[in-house]
Amino acid sequence: PEDLSDLLQNVKFQSSNFENILTWESGPEGTPGTVYSIEYKTYGERDWVAKKGCQRITRKSCNLTVETGNFTELYYARVTAVSAGGRTATKMTDRFSALQHTTLKPPDVTCIPKVRSIQMIVHPTPTPIRAGDGHWLTLEEIFHDLSYRLELQVNRTYQMRLEGKQREYEFFGLTPDTEFLGTITVFVTTWFKESAPYVCRVKTLPDRT
């Protein structure tokens, strides 16, 4: 028997904001003619389900967002590689929990300069997950303890910080006609998740009075 990692390796889910993409790599023996077929299943189920649109493909990724859409469920996926010469290898992922494993993207924020303040409005983050009534769930609806951390760099030594669950924030007491750097991150304490920051560089308006 051959070493299967010669043909196929690093089969794993890459998940961000509940978009769940299966990725893998060809091993050193992988050839351009190698084709890949993907199956998935839930925890404890006997049968693997072939993913339509990801059978005998040559690319090294497959979007399983719809098939893994129950974020309280545990899933597996596996890839079968068949080389041009007829060699085969099958590899499966570890148990995948979207709640546990998905990473958070930077939030979508609008930064509005005023004369002596900067307003920051965080927009709800949509996900590909549908609620029972058919609407798309937002991150805020999935993670009830989701919070935002907003920081405003005033100068090299001074930073203003706000934190909360609400969508609208305002930093007051700023100097007019001055540029500030704002960073906004989203975090979920219970799941030890924190996004990379959204960054906005804004200049307060000049004081016309």
Epitope: G44, R46, M92
Partner: antibody
């Protein structure tokens, strides 16, 4: 046809080590999880731990963590149970069993006797 | 750890009669994702490995005779052999796969009366 065959059991002195093998045939070992379960003479079943043979990720029953190690050689289609610091109470038939939740295929078992 | 307790420890049943084995878990085995119960039943004959009979508390494994059935939910489960045959003499185990470590009941020995 799926088959699991354990080997490597035998008599070992207290404090000794033993490595059990589980040779899988009829399927690729990397296609499903593999478990080790033991049964002391005349007693019930005890789950030792599992491995995802594709990734090497293991989960152990806390009772065995540190003394027992599960591994896989993909090229041999074989799983292993390395047992260290063996004690008399480790005397049992050791089974490998396939699947990730309950166990659909079992080997015939290999007897490990720990005695001086 | 979830403790699985079977009753009785042994039972003797006449050929063709019903055999009922109970299994109680120390916490609910209802898996919220699919509203199924994470419980399996095995049969073990002397000198043989266990054989899977039932999973998800009531799903019969392929090839298992339909006289074997599983029922129950939450913490209380039952394996029923509707008409005991001579070849059903064995020890029967329940197993939970709700959480690590997976645990088994102590076993119930079924004999012919």
């Amino acid at each position: 046809e799926v088959q699991l065959v354990e080997s490597g059991g035998g008599l070992v002195q207290p404090g000794g080590s033993l490595r059990l093998s589980c040779a899988a045939s009829g399927y690729s070992i990397t296609a499903e999880y593999m478990n080790w379960v033991r049964q002391a003479p005349g007693k019930g079943l005890e789950w030792i731990g599992e491995i995802n043979p594709s990734t090497g990720t293991t989960t152990y029953n806390q009772k065995f963590k540190g003394r027992f190690t599960i591994s896989v050689d993909q090229s041999k289609n074989t799983a292993y149970l390395q047992m260290n610091s063996l004690r008399a109470e480790d005397t049992a038939v050791y089974y490998c069993a396939r699947f990730d939740a309950y166990f659909d295929y079992w080997g015939q078992g290999t007897l490990v006797t720990v005695s001086s | 750890d979830i403790v699985m307790t079977q009753s009785p420890d042994s039972l003797a049943v006449s050929l063709g009669e019903r055999a009922t084995i109970n299994c109680k878990s120390s916490q609910s085995l209802l898996y919220s994702s699919n509203q199924k119960n994470t419980l399996a039943w095995y049969q073990q004959k002397p000198g043989q490995p266990p054989k899977l009979l039932i999973y998800w508390a009531s799903s019969r494994e392929s090839g298992v005779p339909d006289r074997f059935s599983g029922s129950g939910s939450g913490t209380d489960f039952t394996l029923t052999i509707s008409s005991l045959q001579a070849e059903d003499v064995a020890v029967y185990y329940c197993q939970q796969y709700y959480s690590y470590p997976f645990t088994f009941g102590q076993g119930t020995k079924v004999e012919i009366k």
